[in-house]
Interface confidence: medium
């Protein structure tokens, strides 16, 4: 299937859903957007870490997830098709597209995706033997916490990182990849 | 920086193959698409086709769907595109550009076919 | 597939001018249409996108316009490192194509 065929037949499922199944993605959506603005109100950054973390240049870098290379896959030829559309635009329309394709055309994203973590994680089990370097250290508020509160912390720290890099890679695109 | 290096030339013999190769730094090569473009002696350019490394997701040129192959090893950030059975006429300089706007270019490799 | 065509395969110009390339398509493409120089030396850069969009660090002297069928790259101020084949290329259908090439030499 070529791209356009497949871009007519993602906006032809939209086109011919009916408002019942698209209000179940706009209830979710509307709802995801409420619990974000009920806890925003409340959330209170702790003491002492307003500053930015220091990111180590060096740490092996979070790897994209599925959904993050099917979007790098398709955003070309969506800018291509619509250099018009703005940022969010092209990616809703993404969102749409990975949201109507198949199990099976998933797997080839979530196979290499699943990869990449491997790999990823060796490499970070790898970094971490090493030991963080001093700079990295100097970023460390308590030293003396336990394992698995250093463990939990690593995992939050992942997360983070992941959504930071997507964003910079998003910009970089941005900048990149303007010539679409 | 953005970098594409290709593979140097190369001179073979009718009805053999080639695999010529595109090393690339400065970008994640992942998540970008390579493009493959073909220059005979004096021509112009004509474009053979693109992948895209993070699924292997190809288009091909239909004049090349029988002649050339394209692969990338994401470990190494290289793309690749291998020749078959090769006659006079894939006597060629073999560009790989990146992105479907092609923004960043290799040098070139020169493939030679003659006996 | 869309064919690209660029009438005048070579310019001849002077420091200075004001040169126009031109580029035709087999059925309109709806302003998809790159730009690219060739130098002499074999070396390929991308110039300008969706018709008329400068790619990063291009010099403003580059110019593009054109809609349909009807294309044009120009340079308002000829310098001696313009000296070189200009293509065009359409993105508006696979397989992307393109133009023949139009070489730029100095009177």
């Known amino acids: 299937v070529n791209f356009s065929e497949f871009s007519k037949k993602c906006s032809e499922r939209w086109k011919t859903m009916s408002a019942k199944e698209k209000g179940k993605f706009e209830d979710m959506a509307k709802a995801d957007k409420a619990r974000y603005e009920r806890e925003m109100k409340t959330y209170i950054p702790p003491k002492g870490e307003t500053k930015k973390k220091f990111k180590d240049p060096n740490a092996p870098k979070r790897p994209p997830s599925a959904f993050f290379l099917f979007c790098s896959e398709y955003r070309p030829k969506i800018k291509g098709e619509h250099p018009g559309l703005s940022i969010g635009d092209v990616a809703k329309k993404l969102g749409e597209m990975w949201n109507n394709t198949a199990a099976d055309d998933k797997q080839p994203y979530e196979k290499k995706a699943a990869k990449l973590k491997e790999k990823y994680e060796k490499d970070i089990a790898a970094y971490r033997a090493k030991g963080k370097p001093d700079a990295a250290k100097k970023g460390v508020v308590k030293a003396e916490k336990s394992k698995k509160k250093k463990e939990e912390e690593d995992d939050e720290e992942d997360e983070e990182d992941e959504e930071e890099e997507e964003e910079e890679e998003d910009e970089d695109e941005e900048e990149d990849d303007d010539d679409e | 920086q953005v970098q594409l290096q290709q593979s140097g030339p190369e001179l073979v013999r009718p009805g053999t193959s080639v695999k010529i190769s595109c090393k690339t730094s400065?970008?994640?090569?992942?998540?970008?698409?390579m493009n493959w473009v073909k220059q005979r002696p004096g021509q112009g350019l004509e474009w053979i086709g693109q992948?895209?490394?993070?699924?292997?997701?190809?288009y091909y040129n239909e004049m090349f769907k029988d002649k050339a192959t394209l692969t990338v090893d994401t470990s190494s950030s290289t793309a690749y595109i291998h020749l078959s059975s090769l006659t006079s006429e894939d006597t060629a300089v073999y560009f790989c550009?990146?992105?479907?706007?092609?923004?960043?270019w290799g040098q070139g490799t020169s493939v030679t076919v003659s006996s | 597939d869309i064919q690209m065509t660029q009438t005048t395969s070579s310019l001849s110009a002077s420091l200075g001018d004001r040169v126009t390339v031109s580029c035709s398509a087999s059925?309109?493409?709806?302003?998809?249409l790159n730009w690219y120089q060739q130098k002499p030396d074999g070396t390929v850069k991308f110039l300008i996108y969706?018709?008329?969009s400068l790619h990063s660090g291009v010099p403003s002297r580059f110019s593009g316009s054109g809609s349909g069928t009807d294309y044009s790259l120009t340079i308002s101020n000829l310098e001696p490192e313009d000296i070189a084949t200009y293509y065009c290329?359409?993105?508006?259908?696979?397989?992307?194509?393109f133009g023949g090439g139009t070489k730029l030499e100095f009177k």
């Open positions: 550009a990146r992105e479907d706007s092609m923004d960043y």
């Open positions: 400065g970008y994640t090569f992942l998540t970008y698409w």
């Open positions: 992948i895209f490394p993070a699924s292997d997701n190809t």
């Open positions: 059925r309109g493409i709806n302003n998809y």
């Open positions: 969706y018709t008329s």
């Open positions: 290329q359409q993105y508006s259908k696979l397989p992307w194509t």
